[in-house]
């Protein structure tokens, strides 16, 4: 089944209903291939294709595709955050697996019997597919938990989670995200928050904000934040710096513009 | 082996309630949903809702909203269906069903949203007659 | 709601025919599809899922295709206890399933 979770976080998502279609554009006319937005996103939208760029929070890559950094990234996460991903061949994944992550555990989960890790079918490692295998193996068992609710924005999805408690560890959340001066606040706070997740161990959803940030790492103009039950988030705007700017909001249907703002 | 075991049939009569329960084993009751899913003799299968094992979340169709709730008790692996206000129409073999958890992997790029319905109960008969 | 229609809703057919069923969403569901298999007095038994996926331990004669609004389950060669109702059931927005089609002996 889909019980095994990944190695890191793990954003647990409701199933999509008709309100939270109701919140959707048409799909776009003309698509090689339909596929949901990114995260827990339940609007369709186009599929990436072969060799196009992709990571976290872009559209997802299409069927047999896998959403990698390349192999000489010294920073594969980061790549992954930032969209500099590539969209590749599922059977190029295999290869890069080792070089991305550690082995998964042998066999053998004292939470979950044989039958568990053998009875359904599972997708396959991406960052952003919908192609899925029936190989359950695939999954490293279970890791962190994130408690997320699918929400729609259109600029980005925002996760807000809950914790019960925080770890104290120090350690950077990968040794390829060290903070650099260079990275602006939202990067900043985006790598402090992602720190506090890596270490916790069970989370539900109460509290943590992770940031849309740009390139260089600031904070885009667009903010959203994830409602419940999957209709869209609450947005707003903001400068660069994160500092909200007034009259720029919604909390229903229709969508806030920021077009006027430099936050880029 | 992992399997549903779902509690024996029912007669009751119009305006009653009833309650299904869903005993699951042989996996990780909270690493899935349970959605309920019944049919009327010689019908066809109509969904009625869902529950998260994980943290009791529901989704409920729309045609039954306010007479059925589902909950779960995470300590005996047993998921529940009850439905009130039984009509004759309401009549039915009740199936529930095990619901991956669709999921995202933050760090790894892991994702799935493989939420067919891989493990069935073997039905409870309802017969709701005056 | 997500109408599912299917067609025919009963077909008869021999052991060794290829059977196809139809399954057509009332909108896009891009790949969001399962089929179910189900005989008389028995739950149903998931077959493919996401279209054209094939649930473990389920043979391989049993196949599944498309993407949007339109769907098939192939049966490449029909055997003794594939006699049964079938069911296409989407998941793009919770669940719904088509109405049924009955293979029945020839």
């Known amino acids: 089944g889909a019980s095994s979770a990944g190695l890191g976080p793990v954003v647990r998502c409701e199933p999509c209903d008709a309100r939270a279609l109701a919140q959707c554009a048409p799909p776009p006319a003309v698509c090689a291939e339909l596929v949901r937005e990114p995260g827990c996103g339940c609007c369709l939208t186009c599929a990436l294709s072969e060799g196009q760029p992709c990571g976290i929070y872009t559209e997802r890559c299409g069927s047999g595709l896998r959403c990698q950094p390349s192999p000489d990234e010294a920073r594969p996460l980061q790549a992954l955050l930032d969209g500099r991903g590539l969209c590749v061949n599922a059977s190029a994944v295999s290869r890069l697996r080792a070089y991305l992550l550690p082995a998964p555990p042998a066999p053998g989960n004292a939470s979950e019997s044989e039958e568990d890790r053998s009875a359904g079918s599972v997708e396959s490692p991406s960052v952003s597919s919908t192609h899925r295998v029936s190989d359950p193996k695939f999954h490293p068992l279970h890791s962190k938990i994130i408690i997320i609710k699918k929400g729609h924005a259109k600029d980005s999805q925002r996760y807000k989670v809950d914790y019960e408690s925080q770890s104290t560890d120090t350690q950077n959340f990968s040794s390829e995200s060290k903070r650099e001066t260079e990275y602006g606040p939202c990067r900043r706070e985006m790598e402090d928050t992602l720190n506090h997740l890596k270490f916790l161990n069970v989370l539900s959803p109460r509290g943590v904000h992770i940031p849309n940030c740009d390139k260089k790492g600031f904070y885009k103009k667009k903010q959203c934040r994830p409602s419940k039950g999957r209709k869209r988030g609450f947005c707003w705007c903001v400068d660069k710096y994160g500092q909200p700017l007034p009259g720029y909001t919604t909390k229903g249907k229709e969508d806030v513009h920021c077009y006027s703002m430099q936050s880029k | 082996e992992v399997q549903l075991v779902q509690s024996g049939a029912e007669v009751k009569k119009p305006g009653a309630s009833v309650k299904v329960s869903c005993k699951a084993s042989?996996?990780?009751?909270?690493?899935?949903?349970i959605s309920w899913v019944r049919q009327a003799p010689g019908q066809g299968l109509e969904w009625m809702g869902w529950i998260s094992a994980y943290n009791g979340n529901t989704n409920y169709a729309q045609k039954l909203q306010g007479r059925v709730t589902m909950t779960t008790d995470t300590s005996t692996s047993t998921a529940y269906m009850e439905l009130r206000s039984l009509r004759s129409d309401d009549t039915a073999v009740y199936y529930c069903a095990r619901v991956p958890s669709e999921y995202y992997d933050f760090w790894s790029g892991y994702y799935t949203e493989e939420n067919a319905f891989d493990i069935w109960g073997q039905g409870t008969m309802v017969t709701v007659s005056s | 709601d997500i109408v599912m229609t299917q067609s025919p809703s009963s077909l008869s057919a021999s052991v060794g025919d290829r059977v196809t069923i139809t399954c057509r969403a009332s909108?896009?569901?891009?790949?969001?599809l399962n089929w179910y298999q189900q005989k008389p007095g028995k739950a149903p038994k998931l077959l493919i899922y996401?279209?054209?996926s094939l649930q473990s331990g389920v043979p391989s004669r049993f196949s599944g295709s498309g993407s949007g609004t339109d769907f098939t389950l192939t049966i490449s060669s029909l055997q003794p206890e594939d006699f049964a109702t079938y069911y296409c059931q989407q998941s793009y927005s919770t669940w719904t399933f088509g109405q049924g089609t009955k293979v029945e002996i020839k």
């Open positions: 996401a279209a054209s």
């Open positions: 042989g996996y990780t009751f909270t690493s899935y949903g």
């Open positions: 909108q896009s569901i891009s790949s969001y």
